[in-house]
Interface confidence: medium
C-alpha cells in the first residue's frame, strides 16, 4: 500500500483491544481546504515505541488503515480510497508493547466536516441568579455550534456538562457556581446540526472563584503610642491563599480575592472623616484612639463576610496635668503645641457613660502661642462639661484633618467639670471630742475625689471665735479625717473643711461650731 | 463583638477584702485599658480603678491605698484587689473597655457587719 492511501488490507498487528486506561482518545476529523483531510488525536500514556494507524470503515462495510507511526496528526486527500461525501466510521488503534489500543469511534461526513474553533479570546463570566453565565465572541465563519463545557474543584475531577445550540454572533453557557470552592472550566464546540461531526479542541482554562471569598484569617497587633502619640498596626498572619483547580495554579486571572483594610476611627466623631479603606499590605499608622479594623475580602463577584477587630484607646502613661483657667465668661484649656497649623480635636466623656456618648470639637488650624501652648476655650453657654461630674478628655492633633491616619494623641486626662469649686465642697463634716485638748473631724469624701489626679488636697481651717486666730491645715487626698490638737477647753471654735484642684481653690463648708467640755476635778 | 464577664463579688464584714476579675473576649487588638466602675442604688456610675495600655494606673482618692488594679496581659484579664473595705463600698462593680460601649454585666459587693 502507498502511504498516501488508506490501506484495504489487514493491519500488521492483532485485532485485540487491550482496554487499559492508556491509548488514544479525542479522535477528531474535519476538512482543512477543497480536496485536503486531517484528523487528530491525543495519546495518554508512556509514548515511547508506540505506532498509531487511523482505522476507517465506508458504508459498504469495507475497512482500511493509515499508517501514522508515532505522530498523533495525519492528512490525506479525496484521492485516498476514503469516502468523503458518504458516512464513515473512524477510530485509532494504537500498538504499544504488544498490545493494541483503541480509541472511541466517530462517525461522520468528511466533507461537511468543517474543523471548529473552541471559544478564543476573552470569555466574560458574570453571576446570574446564582449561576454562572459564560459569554464569548463566536470564531469568525463559525456561527451555529453545539458547546460543552467540563469543570472540576481541587478536589473533584471533570464533569461534564452541556451548554446547548449557539446561534449568533456571541455564545453564552450557564454553569454551575460553587459556593466556597474555585472551579477550572474548559469549553468546546462543534458544528450544530452536521451529524457525527468533531469536537474542538477544550479551551485555555477559565479559572472561577467561589460565590463567597473566603474569610480571612488574620491576626493583628498594635505597637504601643510612641512619643509622638502614634502607634502602628501591624499584620501577624497574612490571610491563607484560595485552593486552586491544578490548571488555574499559577497565574490565575479570575481568581483573585483582594484584601482591604477599612479602618473606623471611633474617637472624636466630629472629625470631617471617620473610615478609610486601605490595602491590606499598607499598614497604617494609628493615634492613641479607639478603632473598628474590618478585612474585606472580595473577588470579582463582590465583597464576601468581613471580620471586624476592635483596636481600644491606648491611654497615656500618666494624665496629663491640663492647665485650665476658669473665668467669669468661660474656661480655656491650655496644653503643649505640636507644631504649626495643626487641628486639635477636644473630645470628652463623663466617666462612667457609654463610650457612644462622647462629645467633642474640632479647633480651627492654630500655631502655637508665645509660650508654646495650643488652646481651647468654650462659654457656659455651651454646655461643654457643664454638669459637675468627671469627664475624661482626649486631645488629637493633626495637620491634615481630613486624612484619617494622621492623626495622633496630644494627651489625655480627667477634668471635673461645671462649678467644681463648689460641687466639690466637702459635706457631713462632723466633730468627736479625742482627747482633754484634742478633736477629730472627719467628712464626707469631696465629689471631686471620684476623678482621677483632680483633686489635690483638702484643707481644714480652724477659728478660734475669741482670739480670731486661724489655723489651716492641709490633708492628703486620700484622707477624709484629721486631728486638730492644741485646743483650750471652754473656748468656742468652728470648723471648716475645703477640697482644691491644681487650678482652683475650693469653697469652704459650713462652719461647725464646738467647744471642748471644761473638766471639773473632784 | 467584645465581651466582659466579671465575677469575684461578694459579701464581707467591714474591714474585709475581696477579688474581682474581668476577662475580656472577642477580635481586641492589642492591650486594652480596662477600667472598674460601681454604681449604688440610686446614684450615678463612678470609676474606682482604671489600668492603662502600658499598665499605668489610676484611682478616684476615695479607693486610693485600698484598691489595686492589676492585669493579665496574655488573655486579656483585670483584677481589682480590694482591701480595708467599707460599707459605702457596696455596688454592683463593672468592668468597662475604656472609653467604650462594652461593659459587662455586674458582679455585686455588698459590705455590712
Known amino acids: 500500500c502507498r502511504t498516501s492511501e488508506c490501506c484495504f488490507q489487514d493491519p500488521p498487528y492483532p485485532d485485540a483491544d487491550s482496554g487499559s486506561a492508556s491509548g488514544p482518545r479525542d479522535l477528531r476529523c474535519y476538512r482543512i481546504s477543497s480536496d485536503r483531510y486531517e484528523c487528530s488525536w491525543q495519546y495518554e500514556g508512556p509514548t515511547a515505541g508506540v505506532s498509531h494507524f487511523l482505522r476507517c470503515c465506508l458504508s459498504s462495510g469495507r475497512c482500511c488503515y493509515f499508517a501514522a507511526g508515532s505522530a498523533t496528526r495525519l492528512q490525506f486527500s479525496d484521492q485516498a480510497g476514503v469516502s468523503v461525501l458518504y458516512t464513515v466510521t473512524l477510530w485509532v488503534e494504537s500498538w504499544a508493547r504488544n498490545q493494541t489500543e483503541k480509541s472511541p469511534e466517530v462517525t461522520l461526513q468528511l466533507y461537511n466536516s468543517v474543523k471548529y474553533e473552541p471559544p478564543l479570546g476573552d470569555i466574560k463570566v458574570s453571576k446570574l441568579a446564582g449561576q454562572l453565565r459564560m459569554e464569548w465572541e463566536t470564531p469568525d465563519n463559525q456561527v451555529g455550534a453545539e458547546v460543552q463545557f467540563r469543570h472540576r474543584t481541587p478536589s473533584s475531577p471533570w464533569k461534564l456538562g452541556d451548554c446547548g445550540p449557539q446561534d449568533d454572533d456571541t455564545e453564552s453557557c450557564l454553569c454551575p457556581l460553587e459556593m466556597n470552592v474555585a472551579q477550572e472550566f474548559q469549553l468546546r464546540r462543534r458544528q450544530l446540526g452536521s451529524q457525527g461531526s468533531s469536537w474542538s479542541k477544550w479551551s485555555s482554562p477559565v479559572c472561577v472563584p467561589p460565590e463567597n471569598p473566603p474569610q480571612p484569617q488574620v491576626r493583628f497587633s498594635v505597637e504601643q503610642l510612641g512619643q509622638d502619640g502614634r502607634r502602628r498596626l501591624t499584620l501577624k498572619e497574612q490571610p491563607t491563599q484560595l485552593e486552586l483547580p491544578e490548571g488555574c495554579q499559577g497565574l490565575a486571572p479570575g481568581t483573585e480575592v483582594t484584601y482591604r483594610l477599612q479602618l473606623h476611627m471611633l474617637s472624636c466623631p466630629c472629625k470631617a472623616k471617620a473610615t478609610r479603606t486601605l490595602h491590606l499590605g499598607k499598614m497604617p499608622y494609628l493615634s492613641g484612639a479607639a478603632y473598628n479594623v474590618a478585612v474585606i475580602s472580595s473577588n470579582q463577584f463582590g465583597p464576601g463576610l468581613n471580620q471586624t477587630w476592635h483596636i481600644p484607646a491606648d491611654t497615656h502613661t500618666e494624665p496629663v496635668a491640663l492647665n485650665i483657667s476658669v473665668g467669669t465668661n468661660g474656661t480655656t484649656m491650655y496644653w503643649p503645641a505640636r507644631a504649626q497649623s495643626m487641628t486639635y480635636c477636644i473630645e470628652w466623656q463623663p466617666v462612667g457613660q457609654d463610650g457612644g456618648l462622647a462629645t467633642c470639637s474640632l479647633t480651627a488650624p492654630q500655631d502655637p502661642d508665645p509660650a508654646g501652648m495650643a488652646t481651647y476655650s468654650w462659654s457656659r453657654e455651651s454646655g461643654a462639661m457643664g454638669q459637675e461630674k468627671c469627664y475624661y478628655i482626649t486631645i488629637f492633633a493633626s495637620a491634615h484633618p481630613e486624612k484619617l491616619t494622621l492623626w495622633s494623641t496630644v494627651l489625655s486626662t480627667y477634668h471635673f467639670g461645671g462649678n467644681a469649686s463648689a460641687a466639690g465642697t466637702p459635706h457631713h463634716v462632723s466633730v468627736k471630742n479625742h482627747s482633754l485638748d484634742s478633736v477629730s473631724v472627719d467628712w464626707a469624701p469631696s465629689l471631686l475625689s471620684t476623678c482621677p489626679g483632680v483633686l489635690k488636697e483638702y484643707v481644714v481651717r480652724c477659728r478660734d471665735e475669741d482670739s480670731k486666730q486661724v489655723s489651716e491645715h492641709p490633708v492628703q487626698p486620700t484622707e477624709t479625717q484629721v486631728t486638730l490638737s492644741g485646743l483650750r477647753a471652754g473656748v468656742a471654735y468652728t470648723v471648716q473643711v475645703r477640697a482644691d484642684t491644681a487650678w482652683l481653690r475650693g469653697v469652704w463648708s459650713q462652719p461647725q461650731r464646738f467647744s471642748i467640755e471644761v473638766q471639773v476635778s473632784d | 463583638e467584645v465581651q466582659l464577664v466579671e465575677s469575684g463579688g461578694g459579701s464581707v464584714q467591714p474591714g474585709g477584702s475581696l477579688r474581682l476579675s474581668c476577662a475580656a473576649s472577642g477580635l481586641i487588638v492589642g492591650r486594652p485599658a480596662m477600667g472598674w466602675y460601681r454604681q449604688a442604688p440610686g446614684k450615678q456610675r463612678e470609676l474606682v480603678a482604671i489600668i492603662g495600655s502600658g499598665g499605668n494606673t489610676n484611682y478616684p482618692e476615695s479607693v486610693k491605698g485600698r484598691f489595686t488594679i492589676a492585669r493579665e496581659n496574655a488573655n486579656n484579664t483585670v483584677y481589682l484587689q480590694m482591701n480595708s473595705l467599707k460599707p459605702e463600698d457596696t455596688a454592683v462593680y463593672h468592668c468597662?473597655?475604656?472609653?467604650?460601649?462594652?461593659w459587662g454585666q455586674g458582679t455585686q459587693v455588698t459590705v455590712s457587719s
Open positions: 468597662n473597655l475604656h472609653g467604650t460601649r462594652f
